[in-house]
Interface confidence: low
């Protein structure tokens, strides 16, 4: 009686179980009563990453330098190429199809989370008592100078973009 299901790494065709092609190889012809499944290795720029019955291998991903991409890991006949972003850029999505520059946090904003290859700089507004006077992809909001600890007084209040200005205390004669 012909089988209705096949073992792992086999597939059912014409009422018989044929072996699947191993990763890195594509199907050329199905097995018959007398012959084994015929498989061929994928070419240099192609891959198949599973046991399969595909008649075509998949093209390796192209890491397009115009999109800010470079090869992180070269593909093999069994694995796809992995792209990553050039220095100073991060992926626009999980699939990393193109890259954008890490953004800088403007004055008045500090870095909450530094950018990585896959996520952008996250900025936060400087709260009261903190400031940032630079546009930076690295600097956090800095606390206002404490004039008291230097035996000075505040001559000019700080803002989210400027530090306080300290000055000498008026001496009472």
């Amino acid at each position: 009686e012909p089988p209705t299901a096949c073992r792992e790494k086999q597939y059912l065709i014409n009422s018989q179980c044929c072996s699947l092609c191993q990763p890195g190889q594509k199907l050329v012809s199905d097995c018959t009563e007398f012959t084994e499944t015929e498989c061929l290795p994928c070419s240099e720029s192609e891959f198949l990453d599973t046991w399969n019955r595909e008649t075509r291998c998949h093209q390796h991903k192209y890491c397009d330098p115009n999109l800010g991409l470079r090869v992180q890991q070269k593909g093999t006949s069994e694995t796809d190429t992995i792209c990553t972003c050039e220095e100073g850029l991060h992926c626009m999505s999980e699939s990393c199809e193109s890259c954008v520059p890490h953004r800088s946090c403007l004055p008045g904003f500090g870095v909450k989370q530094i950018a990585t290859g896959v996520s952008d700089t996250i900025c936060e507004p400087c709260p009261v008592g903190f400031f940032s006077n630079v546009s930076s992809a690295f600097e956090k909001c800095r606390p206002w100078t404490s004039c008291e600890t230097k035996d000075l007084v505040v001559q000019q209040a700080g803002t989210n973009k400027t530090d306080v200005v300290c000055g000498p205390q008026d001496r009472q004669r």
């Epitope: 800010g68 999980e94 890259c99 954008v100 904003f109 996250i122």
Partner: antibody, heavy 120, light 107 residues
Framework: QVQLVQSGAEVKKPGASVKVSCKAS????????VNWVRQAPGQRLEWMGL????????TYNQKFKGRVTLTIDKSASTAYMELSSLRSEDTAVYYC?????????????WGQGTLVTVSS | EIVMTQSPATLSVSPGERATLSCKAS??????VAWYQQKPGQAPRLLIY???DRRTGIPARFSGSGSGTEFTLTISSLQSEDFAVYYC?????????FGQGTKVEIK
């Protein structure tokens, strides 16, 4: 204050194409992704795609692939969305949206919208 | 694609009351969710990004929470200007997808 100013309303016949522009004031687009989102009457917002002004790289919603083209003119700080082979169900308000401080996908700044009506 | 489902479709609330809006993702989107407010004839306005970070200039009565597949937008004390439609957006993977919206109306 960042502003995105879009081109005016359009009326098109089925099968035609429409090109909507989106001009940024105050800052250059470079480094900030520009998303395009549409909203048919009474419907949810629908993301169409985005363009990376830094590289010109685009990512499209497969639903629109082949019909939508996003481009950018960095020197004019203007982004464009062209939709071809228009059908009646493309009648919608089309928005451009850009991110400034927060995150490249969660757009902070939006254009006022451009109504595109497709009717024979 | 990831489907974002918002509930309820309509929420009737009195001014000064608390409103809780829910958004569920069909798969894990980590904390990559944003919330938008939209009033008739206007473009959407970003309120919350990365699930819980309030955009600069947004009043403290708006707060976001959640991660993975379940997210919440809370408006602690509704003001007259808060009556609008609210959308969640997942920005974890392409295509970016919005929920169908929750209309917050005056009770």
């Amino acid at each position: 204050q960042v502003q995105l100013v879009q081109s005016g309303a359009e009326v098109k016949k089925p099968g035609a194409s429409v090109k909507v522009s989106c001009k940024a004031s105050v800052y250059s687009f470079t480094g900030y992704t520009v998303n395009w989102v549409r909203q048919a009457p009474g419907q949810r917002l629908e993301w169409m795609g985005l363009i990376n002004p830094y590289t010109g790289g685009t990512t499209y919603n497969q639903k629109f692939k082949g019909r939508v083209t996003l481009t950018i003119d960095k020197s004019a700080s203007t982004a464009y969305m062209e939709l071809s082979s228009l059908r009646s169900e493309d009648t919608a308000v089309y928005y451009c949206a850009s991110s400034y401080y927060s995150n490249p996908y969660a757009s902070d700044y939006w254009g006022q919208g451009t109504l595109v009506t497709v009717s024979s | 694609e990831i489907v974002m489902t918002q509930s309820p479709a309509t929420l009737s609330v009195s001014p000064g009351e608390r409103a809780t809006l829910s958004c569920k993702a069909s798969q894990n989107v980590h904390t990559r969710v944003a919330w938008y407010q939209q009033k008739p004839g206007q473009a959407p306005r970003l309120l919350i990004y990365l699930a819980s970070d309030r955009r600069t200039g947004i009043p403290a009565r708006f707060s976001g929470s959640g991660s993975g597949t379940e997210f919440t937008l809370t408006i602690s004390s509704l003001q007259s200007e808060d009556f609008a439609v609210y959308y969640c957006l997942q920005h974890w993977t392409y295509p970016l997808t919005f929920g169908q919206g929750t209309k917050v109306e005056i009770k």
